[in-house]
């Protein structure tokens, strides 16, 4: 297993609709054809897997149908979008990248993106 640098923004504010997008960039030392991207959430020192996708270079990322993540790839960059976020989902979202094929296997873990999520203010009751 060899180490690889992964860069991601430090702080992102999700939209009022609970959507957050950020780029995860990795310094690929070779010509990988198969890449696995995993998003981990760290909150109160607990780490959980949010979503994961394996893709062939040049193809779209394919997450599971019920995943809250979507993404696109371009070269050594992965543009990740996480949706359905609520205030309680505020936390550090860490991008983990694995170059699966061809060997050697490379692993890179970013420092994390702190995603702040603000629940929208409830609309005042109005009579029409």
């Amino acid at each position: 297993c060899k180490a690889m640098h992964v860069a991601q923004p430090a702080v992102v504010l999700a939209s009022s609709r609970g959507i957050a997008s950020f780029v995860c960039e990795y310094a690929s030392p070779g010509k990988a054809t198969e890449v696995r991207v995993t998003v981990l959430r760290q909150a109160d020192s607990q780490v959980t897997e949010v979503c994961a996708a394996t893709y062939m270079m040049g193809n779209e990322l394919t997450f599971l149908d019920d995943s809250i993540c979507t993404g696109t790839s371009s070269g050594n960059q992965v543009n990740l979008t996480i949706q359905g976020l609520r205030a309680m989902d505020t936390g550090l979202y860490i991008c983990k990248v694995e170059l699966m094929y061809p060997p050697p296997y490379y692993l890179g873990i970013g420092n994390g993106t702190q995603i702040y999520v603000i629940d929208p203010e409830p609309c005042p009751d109005s009579d029409f």
Partner: antibody, heavy 117, light 108 residues
């Protein structure tokens, strides 16, 4: 080193608007956020809101909603805070601060805004 | 809105003494999102502690933070002359982000 430098003091009349700038250096501007905090004379710190320099999304304190606008110019690594319909109780020192993973650091030197007729 | 109440309002102590400052939240705050700042007259606030207990870069180890839930504490083990200032706690786990009203540490 990481630094935030704010624009100079302003004197405004009630009802006018003020726009304070905050120029960042020493770090990747779009990787962080900028928060604005004000402090009336002899009073404590009041959080006004913040902007994510990465995507431009904003979160404002409810009491200022509709009067405040926070923006960034990523080409010059500068954040702006505009406050409209100024009142005498808006007289304060206005600070910008970098929003990190779980901290505000560093802070700008502050900009005194005086609202007086 | 989470209200942070700091006590005491003023702490009168001598250099070399221990200072214990309290910050109580009206609702539970994740300790990841509780910070302490120091402010001296005419200066901008300075980050001391983040994540309730982690010291910021360059902050002397006489400053320490602790607590969880609704009760947080900033301790200055031995007051130095430059430590006399106003201290604020802040939470940013729940919007709106809020500050306590401050505790002034003054020379006795």
């Amino acid at each position: 080193q990481v630094q935030l430098v704010q624009s100079g003091a302003e004197v405004k009349k009630p009802g006018a608007s003020v726009k304070v700038s905050c120029k960042a250096s020493g770090y990747t501007f779009t990787s962080y956020g900028i928060s604005w905090v004000r402090q009336a004379p002899g009073q404590g710190l009041e959080w006004m809101g913040w902007i994510s320099a990465y995507n431009g999304n904003t979160n404002y304190a409810q009491k200022l909603q509709g009067r405040v606008t926070m923006t960034t110019d990523t080409s010059t690594s500068t954040a702006y805070m505009e406050l409209r319909s100024l009142r005498s109780d808006d007289t304060a020192v206005y600070y910008c601060a970098r929003v990190g993973v779980n901290w505000f650091d560093p802070w700008g030197q502050g900009t005194l805004v005086t609202v007086s007729s | 809105e989470i209200v942070l109440t700091q006590s005491p309002g003023t702490l009168s102590l001598s250099p070399g003494e221990r200072a214990t400052l309290s910050c109580r939240a009206s609702q539970s705050v994740s300790s990841s999102y509780l910070a302490w700042y120091q402010q001296k007259p005419g200066q901008a606030p300075r980050l001391l502690i983040y994540g309730a207990s982690s010291r910021a870069t360059g902050i002397p180890d006489r400053f320490s933070g602790s607590g969880s839930g609704t009760d947080f504490t900033l301790t200055i083990s031995r007051l130095e002359p430059e430590d006399f200032a106003v201290y604020y706690c802040q939470q940013y786990g729940s919007s709106p982000w809020t500050f306590g009203q401050g505790t002034k540490v003054e020379i006795k």
